[in-house]
């Protein structure tokens, strides 16, 4: 329970103004009414409160809104947003992109990734889906924030907005997120010509299945090594040496640099050594001629054993 003090008559607060910066923590607790604070939230960010004072104001709002703040208050949080935890934000219902923009601006330069991810999640829930306006707001005010959404939330993205997504917006996306986004991108770009299609689909290829990689290998796309290294391990393993050579084109030489890293290392273990030799890159670790090892896990164990001895 909160320790209660009485507000001195001369400190009574009738409106939220700059005089409050001179109030001690206890005086703010006793004298600032949460309902008045909420009503005049638009004034708070213009007042240079200390972090300790902001803590008191946050507790006041928590007292007034135990089920989560309404958007009329969230919109005007300003620097008070820096005091919010993901658990606080999870209680919110946000539909306005103006609110989202305001809070994204405030969070810039602060370690707020968990809070921002939760905020974006609440906006997507509030708006029913990740629509074009929301995506545009994210790309403008928070590049990379798209990847903070869960795969479940990303599943609500209509293919029509995929075109607005820039490669750098996907830099922090994990495999599960790309699994969701890739089919949407494929649909969005399906009417484009080969080279144009590849440029557009490339950032999403971390979600591509083997069949699509095989198809791309037939189109002289010359995939760069950085993109290849982001492909799903399971999608790369079934590709033949010839298919990988066609897929990478002149970039195939980069396999030598990456031969100890996944997915290249895992792919090498699956290939016949004589097929690898045709590349002329000196890649080692393929299945020796005349051998057929079906269990890759046994092979990986053997491979590790050879590396250590």
């Amino acid at each position: 329970d909160v320790e209660r003090t009485t507000c001195p008559p001369e400190k009574e607060v009738h409106e939220i103004d700059e005089s409050l910066i001179f109030y001690k923590k206890r005086e703010l607790e006793a004298c600032v009414d949460a309902a008045l604070l909420a009503a005049q939230m638009d004034r708070v960010d213009a007042i240079p409160f200390t972090y300790e004072q902001l803590d008191v104001l946050k507790h006041k709002l928590d007292e007034l809104y135990p089920q989560g703040y309404p958007e009329s208050v969230i919109r005007h949080l300003g620097h008070l947003f820096l005091k919010m935890s993901p658990e606080d934000i999870r209680k919110w219902n946000v539909t306005s992109l103006e609110t989202l923009k305001a809070l994204l601006k405030v969070s810039k330069g602060h370690e707020m990734s968990a809070q921002v991810a939760t905020l974006i999640d609440r906006v997507v829930v509030g708006r029913g889906q990740l629509d074009k306006d929301t995506a545009d707001t994210l790309t403008a005010f928070c590049p990379g924030c798209l990847c903070s959404l869960s795969p479940e939330r990303l599943s609500s993205v209509p293919p029509s907005i995929i075109g607005a997504v820039r490669p750098q917006d996907l830099d922090t996306c994990g495999p599960r997120q790309l699994d969701v986004l890739y089919p949407k991108a494929r649909l969005a770009f399906q009417n484009m010509s080969g080279s144009e299609y590849f440029v557009k689909i490339r950032p999403f290829l971390g979600g591509a299945p083997t069949e699509d990689l095989k198809a791309l290998s037939q189109q002289n796309v010359s995939m760069d090594l950085a993109t290849f290294m982001k492909l799903r391990r399971e999608a790369v393993l079934p590709l033949s040496v010839a298919e990988v050579q066609k897929l990478l084109g002149p970039h195939v030489e980069g396999l030598k640099v990456e031969e100890q890293h996944s997915p290249v290392r895992d792919w090498i273990l699956k290939q016949r050594q004589d097929d690898l030799d045709t590349l002329g890159l000196g890649l080692q670790g393929g299945i020796p001629n005349g051998y057929l090892i079906l269990d890759l896990s046994v092979r990986e164990a053997l491979s590790h054993h050879h590396h250590h001895h």
Epitope: D1, A34, A35, A39, Q40, Y65, Q67, P70
Partner: antibody
Framework: EVQLLESGGGLVQPGGSLRLSCAAS????????MSWVRQAPGKGLEWVSN????????NYADSVKGRFTISRDNSKNTLYLQMNSLRAEDTAVYYC????????????WGQGTLVTVSS | EIVLTQSPGTLSLSPGERATLSCRAS???????LAWYQQKPGQAPRLLIY???SRATGIPDRFSGSGSGTDFTLTISRLEPEDFAVYYC?????????FGQGTKVEIK
Amino acid sequence: EVQLLESGGGLVQPGGSLRLSCAASGFTFTNTYMSWVRQAPGKGLEWVSNISPTYSTTNYADSVKGRFTISRDNSKNTLYLQMNSLRAEDTAVYYCARYNSYQGGLDYWGQGTLVTVSS
Amino acid sequence: EIVLTQSPGTLSLSPGERATLSCRASQSVSSSYLAWYQQKPGQAPRLLIYGASSRATGIPDRFSGSGSGTDFTLTISRLEPEDFAVYYCQQSYYYPITFGQGTKVEIK
């Protein structure tokens, strides 16, 4: 079902004291702002005071400041109004009301208790 | 303090007619903190409208609120017999919280 039941009203002489109670049920009292509003006979509504749930921050109308004290006992789900130095102009029906912070309005009211200040 | 002035003081109308009640604030208040109440003789007030335009739970859609800044309006599109009562506006944007003096809607 939300219920607010006021008690403690009655006839009191000028300068006397009275304590009103409001028993609340049907909602989470410990989370809720509460208010007292009064209505003099044949007149309009006048806000008297309110109190916050956790910090018990209080506010009063100028007409009662220094004479009335609002308080609450969260363990008993009860709101109080201690009225001292009563005047004839304090004669009114006193309503206890729940302030809905999400709406900015008083969404549930008791039926009121009459306080008459007269010699 | 914010003074809320309601007009007219009394409105004489017949059932089925439209009622328009006005509430003017002495200075601008946020519409999120403007409410309307209905009170019938011998009864406690009842919240009708909050946030200037949102109907409270169980309030029929013939009641609507509008306005911003200093001018707010409560409209009853078609008066029903049970709507004849006193109506108050109230602001909780500034302390002290204040009510208007009320508008009585009576049967013509």
